[in-house]
Interface confidence: low
Amino acid sequence: RWRQQWSGSGTTSRFPETVLARCVKYTEVHPEMRHVDCQSVWDAFKGAFISKYPCNITEEDYQPLVKLGTQTVPCNKTLLWSRIKDLAHQFTQVQRDMFTLEDMLLGYLADDLTWCGEFNTFEINYQSCPDWRKDCSNNPVSVFWKTVSRRFAETACGVVHVMLNGSRSKIFDKNSTFGSVEVHNLQPEKVQALEAWVIHGGREDSRDLCQDPTIKELESIISKRNIRFFCKNIYRPDKFLQCVKNPEDSSCLSGI
């Protein structure tokens, strides 16, 4: 039968099995989430988008899932990132008491996956899904990340860290998930400060990227929200990771 053609790639192959398997794996490794019933998690996930028009998904659709996946991060342990996911994840793999959204259950379930359904059928669309730019922004994947990112930011406390990509023309991009969602949902009564780590790409790049206009813009937004702002240049990301692993290494006493 006829199926709507969207501009984006279709649901990831074996999506239900992947989500369920990831959930089981996560709850096995994280004892504080052992109470989670993965079948209920999948049912709630499915319920958010199955048989719904995939350009009309709301944050409300994901609330049952968000409720099941409730998790807290200790104060000072939240790591946000923008356009530099791999390094952020490498960092939390080594500094294993800090957490990105993808280290939490819901972020872990959905990381790198695509999904969507169709209006009035119980089928998953493996052929195509709406593209954020070409089709619509209220699609299942975009709304999911907006929902869980908002929640992740809302629950952060203490000093929050964010890793930013110094190689991009807009180091801080107001249109990114960090710039459009997370920044505005940090709670001033719980968050004392936001510390930005600007990751340099070039070997010989010794500029102070904390003086970049977009970083100044971020500082302004954060300061207006009554949250202090700090910024650090990470000139050598490779050395940075090595020094996280071994802070006593003599070479780590010099700048990174």
Partner: antibody
Framework: QVQLVQSGAEVVKPGASVKMSCKAS????????MHWVKEAPGQRLEWIGY????????NYNQKFQGRATLTADTSASTAYMEISSLRSEDTAVYFC?????????????WGQGTLVTVSS | DIVLTQSPATLSLSPGERATISCRAS??????????MHWYQQKPGQPPRLLIY???SRATGIPARFSGSGSGTDFTLTISPLEPEDFAVYYC?????????FGGGTKLEIK
Amino acid sequence: QVQLVQSGAEVVKPGASVKMSCKASGYTFTSFNMHWVKEAPGQRLEWIGYIYPGNGGTNYNQKFQGRATLTADTSASTAYMEISSLRSEDTAVYFCARTGGLRRAYFTYWGQGTLVTVSS
Amino acid sequence: DIVLTQSPATLSLSPGERATISCRASESVDSYGNGFMHWYQQKPGQPPRLLIYLASSRATGIPARFSGSGSGTDFTLTISPLEPEDFAVYYCQQNKEDPWTFGGGTKLEIK
């Protein structure tokens, strides 16, 4: 400083159960997983599992699931391991161990060990 | 389960010499560019003591003569020069996957 002090040696009969303790001090007991490791004569060290005292959540090595039970008393900052249906191959030294931090799964702090001898 | 095979089982050396202990995993223990392999020293009647974590990082208070290297499935603990107090049993341990597993141990004895 972090200290883990374990209960004394036990001699038990086959088929019986044994419950040993590990009293923690020098840190916030509810914030760190407490692991248990088995050292049997002539065998490699075996990881049994761990408990998160903050909410009682556990994670067991499949091999020990069902016979080992991990519990914690947060008011006494003490973790417990009970092993049921004991057999001769359970004769071993059992260590409690704490990792360096949440999700840092290498063992920075160890108890002195509890020797369990299964003998009729 | 990931099986860790240590070699040699016994190593006989004299103080001042270099000890090299190998640990081979049945599958890669790398994740995000790090080897999730750790090394411990154990002396009779004592619990193990952490020496090296994440393949190559020395634990707090461990002398510089202990070093770790390797990635993927092959890891090495090197002690040089050997001191009299270094004669003990050494274990590798992985935490890439549950269940976390240990190697069979290498006994380092005085020649």
